[in-house]
């Protein structure tokens, strides 16, 4: 807390300008009117205040707005945003995407801080859903943003917003998140033709069910091994050797290098060795010839 002292004669600030950088902390406290500061916040960013001086300016705004800053002040916070605590931010009502962008810009170069997470949470809750423009903005600043959301939060993403998602935005998503995003992506891209559709849907396929993979295998998509390795194991297991061969196209040779890793390993164990041999890759571990394959899951369903 800065001590209350009288402003020295002739030092009362009439406007927010460069001369203030020469004020000691106590002079800023005593000589800068909080209301003046609030109306001229747009000037603060052009003045190279020290972080100690910014502490004083924040203190003045906190006194003026104990219930939380108005958006007219928030959008011009600049470096002052770095001084805010999540508790400060919870008092705000941020509705403008421009304000959000301005504050995210200040934090650029840093990981997502608790302050930014709180700001985004307040903003999205205020909007009611994660619309395309917001998602565009958030993923531009934080490519991993989407994968930081819970499946429940992701369920509020409208399919139209999926157009804003880039492949790198999904890099850290787990299967549970892709399970939620895949049906939205399928809906969003449903009117595209085969090859274009595959390019768009590819990053989301970690959430695809077996029947969709079977359908893709009929479309000469040539899925790369990296994508195949991210597919759900339970979705891959029912695929036949012929379907996997069609799905991967020229990339099928890559199965050999991955034969000890999931889902390839588990898929091999489910295939007849005869069928695997037709690939000519030397894949081993399939069901030997003459063995009867019982589908236990089917048996359980009948009993």
């Amino acid at each position: 807390e800065v001590e209350k002292t009288a402003c020295p004669s002739g030092k009362k600030a009439r406007e927010i300008d460069e001369s203030l950088i020469f004020y000691k902390k106590w002079e800023l406290e005593a000589c800068v009117d909080a209301a003046l500061l609030a109306t001229q916040m747009d000037r603060v960013n052009a003045i190279p205040f020290t972080y100690e001086q910014l502490d004083v300016l924040k203190h003045k705004l906190d006194e003026l707005y104990p219930q939380g800053y108005p958006e007219s002040v928030i959008q011009h916070l600049g470096y002052l945003f770095l001084k805010m605590s999540p508790e400060d931010i919870r008092k705000w009502n941020v509705t403008s995407l421009e304000t959000l962008k301005a504050l995210l810009e200040v934090n650029k170069g840093h990981e997502m801080s608790p302050q930014v997470a709180t700001l985004i949470d307040r903003f999205v809750k205020g909007r009611g859903q994660l619309d395309k423009d917001t998602l565009d903005t958030l993923t531009a600043f934080y490519p991993g943003y989407l994968c930081s959301l819970s499946p429940e939060e992701l369920s509020s993403v409208p399919p139209s917003s999926i157009w804003a998602v880039r492949p790198q935005d999904l890099d850290t998503c787990d299967p549970r998140q892709l399970d939620v995003l895949y049906p939205k992506a399928r809906l969003a891209f449903q009117n595209m033709n085969g090859s274009e559709y595959f390019v768009k849907i590819q990053s989301f396929l970690g959430g695809a069910p077996t029947e969709d993979l079977k359908a893709l295998s009929q479309q000469n998509v040539s899925m790369d091994l990296a994508t195949f390795m991210k597919l759900r194991t339970d979705a891959v297991l029912p695929l036949t050797v012929a379907e996997v061969q069609k799905l991967l196209g020229p990339h099928v040779e890559g199965l050999k290098a991955e034969e000890r890793h999931r889902p390839v390993r588990d898929w091999i164990l489910r295939q007849r060795q005869d069928d695997l041999d037709t690939l000519g890759l030397g894949l081993q571990g399939g069901i030997p010839n003459g063995y009867l394959v019982l589908d236990l899951s089917m048996q359980e369903a009948l009993s």
């Epitope: 950088i21 020469f22 190279p48 200040v106 170069g109």
Partner: antibody, heavy 120, light 108 residues
Framework: QVQLVQSGAEVKKPGASVKVSCKAS????????LHWVRQAPGQGLEWMGI????????NYAQKFQGRVTMTRDTSISTAYMELSSLRSEDTAVYYC?????????????WGQGTLVTVSS | DIVLTQSPATLSLSPGERATLSCRAS???????LAWYQQKPGQAPRLLIY???NRATGVPARFSGSGSGTDFTLTISSLEPEDFAVYYC?????????FGQGTKVEIK
Amino acid sequence: QVQLVQSGAEVKKPGASVKVSCKASGYTFTSYALHWVRQAPGQGLEWMGIINPQNGGTNYAQKFQGRVTMTRDTSISTAYMELSSLRSEDTAVYYCARKHKYRIGSMDVWGQGTLVTVSS
Amino acid sequence: DIVLTQSPATLSLSPGERATLSCRASQSLTSNQLAWYQQKPGQAPRLLIYDSSNRATGVPARFSGSGSGTDFTLTISSLEPEDFAVYYCQQYGSFPATFGQGTKVEIK
């Protein structure tokens, strides 16, 4: 033309103080803040602080707080930078530089530099 | 303090070639408060660019600055013999002002 002329080279012992001067000409001395920047031999530039010649107000880099004093004498359009408790790592060329017309943080006119050598 | 990282440390080029120098800030400079200076051996630095892209008085048009936020670039479109020097970027978004470690442009 606008010029900043600095005092000559100095050799000091560790623990001593040095006072470098910077005489301005060709413009109104009190209208432009002055920065002090130093450069150790073969190294980069390091900002020390800034003085407002109009009222003597200063803003020092935390690193130098307590050791640096910036003053001015408006009657002779001269600014001074005094650094105390010198150590060998203070050996550097010290520059004064005038603030840019539009931006207090950038520097459009520089003095020629003063070499300060700290050696026992 | 805001840290500025310049790259490359040294740039070996021939006269007439284009030079591209990079400066990255550890945090966003909200009003693009970044300057570029040129320094030759035994001389004081000389201001080339301020506010990221504005040329200082008397600076030739072959020098241009660009960038915003955290990434900034100084471009010399066609190197003249007198351009071989060390170049520093400096931020003044927040005091203390800080400088990059410098990029030396040398003759190939």
